[in-house]
């Protein structure tokens, strides 16, 4: 049992996570994350599963956030903007979008960097998972600190 | 002892700060802040030091955030994007980047405004300091509410 | 009394809200919100009033945030950037700006989407209200997850 967990006592441990983006060869639009660098994983009441979703064991209100930096060019990209979505999958429920942000592609060559930040307070059920989806994962920047994902239980 | 500190009892006081950007004639890339306007400084367990870093006295998990609004022009700026970095200096450790955001310069004349928001959960040691670094401080907007920096202890 | 309120006991209930943007025919620059979709309203210690402001009953430190996605075009808009402001109205006080973000309009046609995120820690008095103001509400995107507003009490 770690120091975060002990601060509030066994009944109400601190629950928080912050994970770091990881480049992936997978063709999925769901971003991949890792417990590397200056990451946070308070205890086993929140876990990173399959490198793609943060899963919580306890029901409650959570502040959930994601930051995505990407590099794109208007001519080389589809007409649609770059969209990052924070999504929820609860046991027995369909996936749903919690938050989205959209940025039109830059005219800078070869590509122009832009950063998106998402964050909000949501109730999560036991076993609920949150994940981040983007329109084009190949455009995401994985340099130190550029793209991250996390939550904290209120 | 103020009302924030008393809410949770002496053992677990609320710790939070929100400081306001200040224009600086210094040539450093580290942004300057002030306890002015509608600022927050919950108690002496978090302090603003040298106008540039928020320093905490207690170990724990903190949600740390910064918002930077800047005005730049592609032709008048270097080719590199505007980057804002949230950085950490812990006693006996090197400075390190926690979070970064990048925005390509605007083509608007004389300059185009853009806003960056950074935020994440990190463990801080006693005496740790967090600060904000930017590629070009002269481009930062200091109008009311545009650029700010803060943290809260979970 | 709901489950959020009970978690911390009657003396220190959880207080949090997350509301969803709503298109409005009103000509006001203050954004409209609704308790719809995946919204949060922890208890009656925070309320959405007139569909435009979050009002708190208890004094304390709150992390307040807003996200606004908008679609605009440089030629079709005024020369001034799109600005989103998080504002405070306390009983017996003038309204004041807490946070602002600015983004220059896109050159994309018919319009280019961009997202703004605002967030910070502020002390609120009993009866204080926070609201979001934008330069042009007609440009705001109301698709699922694009524009939201919330707070949590520390």
């Amino acid at each position: 049992e770690n120091s975060f967990e002990m601060q509030k006592g066994d009944q109400n441990p601190q629950i928080a996570a912050h994970v770091i983006s990881e480049a992936s060869s997978k063709t999925t639009s769901v971003l991949q994350w890792a417990e590397k660098g200056y990451y946070t994983m308070s205890n086993n009441l929140v876990t990173l599963e399959n490198g793609k979703q943060l899963t919580v064991k306890r029901q409650g209100l959570y502040y959930i956030y994601a930051q995505v930096t990407f590099c794109s060019n208007r001519e080389a990209s589809s007409q649609a903007p770059f969209i990052a979505s924070l999504c929820l999958k609860s046991p027995g429920r369909f996936e749903r979008i919690l938050l989205r942000a959209a940025n039109t592609h830059s005219s800078a060559k070869p590509c122009g960097q832009q950063s998106i930040h998402l964050g909000g307070v949501f109730e999560l059920q036991p076993g609920a998972s949150v994940f981040v989806n983007v329109t084009d994962p190949s455009q995401v920047s994985h340099g130190t600190g550029f793209t991250s994902f996390g939550l904290l239980k209120l | 002892e103020n009302s924030f500190e008393m809410q949770k009892g002496d053992q677990n006081p609320q710790i939070a700060a929100h400081v306001i950007s200040e224009a600086s004639s210094k040539t450093t890339s580290v942004l300057q802040w002030a306890e002015k306007g509608y600022y927050t400084m919950s108690n002496n367990l978090v302090t603003l030091e040298n106008g540039k870093q928020l320093t905490v006295k207690r170990q724990g998990l903190y949600y740390i955030y910064a918002q930077v609004t800047f005005c730049s022009n592609r032709e008048a700026s270097s080719q590199a994007p505007f980057i804002a970095s949230l950085c950490l200096k812990s006693p006996g450790r090197f400075e390190r980047i926690l979070l970064r955001a990048a925005n390509t310069h605007s083509s608007a004349k004389p300059c185009g405004q853009q806003s960056i928001h950074l935020g994440g959960v990190f463990e801080l040691q006693p005496g740790a300091s967090v600060f904000v670094n930017v590629t070009d401080p002269s481009q930062v907007s200091h109008g009311t509410g545009f650029t700010s920096f803060g943290l809260l202890k979970l | 009394e709901n489950s959020f309120e009970m978690q911390k006991g009657d003396q220190n209930p959880q207080i949090a809200a997350h509301v969803i943007s709503e298109a409005s025919s009103k000509t006001t620059s203050v954004l409209q919100w609704a308790e719809k979709g995946y919204y949060t309203m922890s208890n009656n210690l925070v309320t959405l009033e007139n569909g435009k402001q979050l009002t708190v009953k208890r004094q304390g430190l709150y992390y307040i945030y807003a996200q606004v996605t908008f679609c605009s075009n440089r030629e079709a808009s005024s020369q001034a950037p799109f600005i989103a402001s998080l504002c405070l109205k306390s009983p017996g006080r003038f309204e004041r700006i807490l946070l602002r973000a600015a983004n220059t309009h896109s050159s994309a046609k018919p319009c280019g989407q961009q997202s703004i995120h605002l967030g910070g820690v502020f002390e609120l008095q009993p009866g204080a209200s926070v609201f979001v103001n934008v330069t042009d509400p007609s440009q705001v995107s109301h698709g699922t997850g694009f524009t939201s507003f919330g707070l949590l009490k520390l």
Partner: nanobody, 129 residues
């Protein structure tokens, strides 16, 4: 590539003071963490003090922090070490070291030699009793 050249060493009596300098040339030293180490005759090289690249925050060896002060002048690209109340046991070759800000390793402790990318040739300080 950064070149580091120390100066200011010499013979000094116990209780005296010295100021060492380290001139950095090459790529901008603004982006480097800088430190002083020392190596006494027949002993291992040990950490003295470090100063961070952005904040200018300082870290010291516990046994030296009351007498030694590290500082830097970014305009002159120079690192300094002010040494007061010198003792015979301070006799050593003093080395200037630099580490790139962007450099990450498994350890990020400022007092570990392995974490520095560039070293000067050293300057000898002799304290007589």
């Amino acid at each position: 590539e950064v070149q580091l050249v120390e100066s200011g060493g010499g013979l000094v009596q116990a209780g005296g003071s010295l100021r060492l300098s380290c001139a950095a040339s090459g790529r901008t030293p603004l982006n480097y963490h800088m430190a002083w180490f020392r190596q006494a005759p027949g002993k291992e090289r040990e950490f003295v003090a470090a100063i961070s690249s952005l904040l200018g925050s300082t870290d010291y060896s516990d046994s030296l922090k009351d007498r030694f002060t590290i500082s830097r002048d970014n305009a002159k690209a120079t690192l300094y070490l002010r040494m007061n109340n010198l003792k015979p046991e301070d006799t050593a070759v003093y080395y200037c070291a630099a580490r790139e800000t962007t450099h990450y390793s498994t350890s990020d402790r400022v007092n570990e030699m392995r974490n520095y990318d560039y070293w000067g040739q050293g300057t000898l300080v002799t304290v007589s009793s």
